[in-house]
Amino acid sequence: VPLSRTVRCTCISISNQPVNPRSLEKLEIIPASQFCPRVEIIATMKKKGEKRCLNPESKAIKNLLKAVSKERSKRSP
């Protein structure tokens, strides 16, 4: 599992392999913070619940982040 044990970033390695949406259980988005300078995307796969860190610079994830922030601005009070 590519998750670090430090209190800084959660991901220590990033998968550049494209993720098939059918194999995804969920995606967790951890925004950049004082503990970790970069946004982190953690994919939980349907099979065996394996966790994978995805590349936030990939086109697919950029599209996803754009959609999430759009959704966020619609719903924020």
Epitope: P18, V19, N20, P21, R22, L24, E25, K26, L27, E28, I29, I30, P31, S33, K59, A60, N63, L64, A67, V68, E71, R72, R75, S76
Partner: antibody, heavy 134, light 110 residues
């Protein structure tokens, strides 16, 4: 309103190429998967494949793998089904339909979650007929 | 040959209750949900039941679905003449990595 409109069908000679279009309106195109299904005369529905425009990834039924290409253009909310060489057995009514939906939860927390819910094909186009004949 | 097995035909008189079965395996219905579609003559299919037993808005409660093990069922109670159509079950198949349909059941209202 929410709709899908197919176009591009007609009578085509065997061996010719063809591209069908599926124009979406009334919903956020990239937040769903778009599926292609066919209904050959006298037979039942067949799933050809699907594309998730947000990820740009297509899945194909084994039978159609390498025979067709599914793509999407997010900028114009349109999905495509393409053949480079049609066969008589490709004669069918072709439908596009909306499937998996991206749902965002915990939006206002510092860890939003995204899930993709495949709750069935809830919006269908009117269909476009492809007849492959010489 | 379809991956999911449905009876090719079913019939009933107005007001009757009709059940259409859909049999699969552990790689499709056994581990995924069942959806049902209605295809009226000359029209595009429409979603009748999703997630085994859920009805989309606008679908009358005469239509109900259930799943047990590797099989699904569609029940139409209080049959009406406008229910005459082809009915298809569908599921995702983990082995084939694709959506699979039943062969369809032609329902005749006598």
């Amino acid at each position: 309103q929410v709709q899908l409109v197919e176009s591009g069908g007609g009578v085509v000679q065997p061996g010719r190429s063809l591209r069908l279009s599926c124009a979406a309106s009334g919903f956020t195109f990239s937040s769903f998967s778009i599926t292609w299904i066919r209904d050959p005369p006298g037979k039942g529905l067949e799933w050809i494949g699907e594309i998730t425009p947000m990820f740009g990834i297509a899945n194909y039924a084994q039978k159609f793998q390498g025979q067709v290409t599914i793509s999407a253009d997010k900028s114009i909310s349109t999905a495509y089904l393409q053949w480079s060489s049609l066969k008589a057995s490709d004669t069918a009514m072709y439908y596009c339909a909306r499937d998996g939906r991206f749902d965002v939860s915990d939006l206002l927390t510092d860890k939003p979650k995204v899930t993709i819910n495949y709750n069935g094909m809830d919006v269908w186009g009117q269909g476009t007929l492809v007849t492959v004949s010489s | 040959q379809s991956v999911l097995t449905q009876p090719p035909s079913a019939s009933g008189t107005p007001g009757q209750r009709v059940t259409i079965s859909c049999s699969g395996s552990s790689s499709n219905i056994g581990s995924n949900t069942v959806n049902w579609y209605q295809e009226l003559p000359g029209a595009a299919p429409q979603l009748l039941i999703y997630n085994n037993d859920q009805r989309p808005s606008g679908i009358p409660d005469r239509f109900s679905g259930s799943k047990s093990g590797t099989s699904g069922s569609l029940v139409i109670s209080g049959l009406q003449s406008e229910d005459e159509a082809d009915y298809y079950c569908a599921s995702w198949d983990d082995s084939l990595n694709g959506r699979v349909f039943g062969g369809g059941t032609k329902l005749t209202v006598l």
